[in-house]
Amino acid sequence: EEELQMIQPEKLLLVTVGKTATLHCTVTSLLPVGPVLWFRGVGPGRELIYNQKEGHFPRVTTVSDLTKRNNMDFSIRISSITPADVGTYYCVKFRKGSPENVEFKSGPGTEMALGAKPSAPVVLGPAARTTPEHTVSFTCESHGFSPRDITLKWFKNGNELSDFQTNVDPTGQSVAYSIRSTARVVLDPWDVRSQVICEVAHVTLQGDPLRGTANLSEAIRVPPTLEVTQQPMRVGNQVNVTCQVRKFYPQSLQLTWSENGNVCQRETASTLTENKDGTYNWTSWFLVNISDQRDDVVLTCQVKHDGQLAVSKRLALEVTVHQKDQSSDATP
C-alpha cells in the first residue's frame, strides 16, 4: 500500500491585501481515512484555519469538492486577505480516531507573505544636453515593492545595456522596498530617435515586467556643420550666397549674416527640413548687391545653436570684371 504523502508545492505564496489566496495541498492516498486540516504555524499555539469535518470557516472555501469520490485535492482559498493572515500554512492529515483524531502527517508548509507591486519605473535623464561620443547617465527608480528580490534591466533601442549600477533599499527587513539604478549611455550621432528603457521584473507582476522610458532626444545635442557657397548664376546685379546648416538637434537655432563684419539686418529666405534620423537641416539664402562692389567682400554665416557658442563660416565673394561690367550696364 502506497504511503500517504502530503504535497504543498509552493514554498512561498505572495498575496495582495484584499485579494483571495489559494493554498495548494494534495495527498497521494485516501488512506488512512481521516480529515485534512489546515493550520497556521506549528506547535501547541498553532491556529486552526480549516477543518473539512468540523466547524464553520466563512472566509475559507475548498478548491475541489471534498465529497467527490477519490478526491485527493485539499487546497483551500482564503478570501479578503489582510496583513494579519501572513504566516506559514500547513495542511495536516489526521487519522480517524476514537474519541479523538490522531495527527498522521503534515505537509512541508507554504509561507504566505504580503506582496506589493513595484511602482511604474520613472526614468530621468541628464539635466543638460551632451554631444555624441560623450557618456550620459540615466536614473531609474521604482518604489513600494515587496519582497525585496527584484530584477532591473536597461535597454537602448532593444539592446541590453551592461554599464549600470543598482541599489535596493533598505538592506534589512522592511514592509516595502525601493530600487534605484543608474545607467551610463554613450551617445551616438543618430540617437535623436533613440530610447532608453528601464525594465523591472518582480514576482508580483506575474511575468509581466514594468517599463519606464526616456527619449535620448532630451539628452542629446548634435552640433551643426556649416557650409557657405556662392551660386554661380546671378540675378541682375545680385549674387546669391547659401549657408547650409546640416544635421543639428535640437531645432533651436539663430542664424545671422555679416558683410565685411557688419551684421545685416535685412530679411533672408530660409527653409528648415527634418532628416530621417531626427536631426534638422537649415538653408539660408543671402542676396548680395554687386553693382558697386569692391573685390574684397567677405560674407559670414554665423550660427548660434541651442545656446552654445556661435560657430561661423566665411566666404570671400568672387566678383569678376565681366560680372561688374554686366552689372553696371544693368538698368535700375
Epitope: 485516501l30 488512506l31 481515512v33 473539512q52 469535518k53 468540523e54 466547524g55 464553520h56 469538492d65 471534498l66 465529497t67 467527490k68 469520490r69 477519490n70 480517524k96
Partner: antibody, heavy 121, light 111 residues
C-alpha cells in the same frame, strides 16, 4: 461524543404517512452526509435514503423500493435529518436507523439506536 | 443493484480459533485502487457497529483480532483469536455504486 437519536416510529396502517426525525449531536452536522437504513427479519439490512451537503445542493438518493414515496430532508440549523414516508406498505415495517456517513462513501461510522415502524392493518 | 452474498449463513467457532466469513459481490466494488467494502458487527438489540472500512482498514477502537482482505468481488473478514464477546451477526456492505447494499449476514456462535 457523537450521538444520533431517532424518533417518530410507531404503528401505522397501510397507505398512511409518517415522519421520522433524527437529532444529531457531538459533531458538525452540516459537514456530513446522512442516511437512513432499515432492518427487518425478512429483508435484513436495507439502505433507504441519503442526503448530501449544502455544497452538494442537498442532493438526495433513494432505494428503488421507496422512490416516490419517501423523502429525506435535513435542517442543518437544528442538526436534524428527517424521513417523510407516504403511502406506507407492510414491507416498510422495520427498525429505521439514522446514520452518519463519515467519508462521503457510505462509510457508516455512527448509527442511532433506531426507531421501530410497524405497518399493519 | 450489486448483490452481496455472504457465506456461511452461520458458523460456530471455538474460543481462540479463527472465524472466516466470506462476502461475494455480483459486480466489482473496486475503483481507482480502492475497495469499497465495509464490515459490521451487530449484537441483539443494538445497531450495527463498523469494524472494517475500504476492505482492509481497521476502524478506530476495533480490536486488532479483526482483519479484512480482498478486492474486486471477493472479500473476507477474519477474526482471530475469537473471543466470547465476538458472538454476533456480521454484515458486509458495499459503496461501489448506488444503491448501497448489505449482505444477508453471518451469525457467529462461540463454542
Amino acid at each position: 461524543e457523537v450521538k444520533l437519536e431517532e424518533s417518530g416510529g410507531g404503528l401505522m396502517q397501510p397507505g398512511g404517512s409518517m415522519k421520522l426525525s433524527c437529532v444529531a449531536s457531538g459533531f458538525t452536522f452540516s459537514n456530513y452526509w446522512m442516511n437512513w437504513v432499515r432492518q427487518s427479519p425478512e429483508k435484513g439490512l436495507e439502505w433507504v435514503a441519503e442526503i448530501r451537503l449544502k455544497s452538494n445542493n442537498y442532493a438526495t438518493h433513494y432505494a428503488e423500493s421507496v422512490k416516490g414515496r419517501f423523502t429525506i430532508s435535513r435542517d442543518d440549523s437544528k442538526s436534524s435529518v428527517y424521513l417523510q414516508m407516504n403511502n406506507l406498505r407492510a414491507e416498510d415495517t422495520g427498525i429505521y436507523y439514522c446514520i452518519r456517513d463519515y467519508d462521503y462513501d457510505a462509510y457508516f461510522d455512527y448509527w442511532g439506536q433506531g426507531t421501530t415502524l410497524t405497518v399493519s392493518s | 443493484d450489486i448483490v452481496l452474498t455472504q457465506s456461511p449463513a452461520s458458523l460456530a467457532v471455538s474460543l481462540g480459533q479463527r472465524a472466516t466469513i466470506s462476502c461475494r459481490a455480483s459486480k466489482s466494488v473496486s475503483t481507482s485502487g480502492y475497495n469499497y467494502m465495509y464490515w459490521y458487527q451487530q449484537k441483539p438489540g443494538q445497531p450495527p457497529k463498523l469494524l472494517i472500512y475500504l476492505a482492509s482498514n481497521l476502524e478506530s477502537g476495533v480490536p486488532a483480532r479483526f482483519s479484512g482482505s480482498g478486492s474486486g468481488t471477493d472479500f473476507t473478514l477474519n477474526i482471530h483469536p475469537v473471543e466470547e464477546e465476538d458472538a454476533a451477526t456480521y454484515y458486509c456492505q458495499h459503496s461501489g455504486e448506488l444503491p448501497y447494499t448489505f449482505g444477508g449476514g453471518t451469525k457467529l456462535e462461540i463454542k
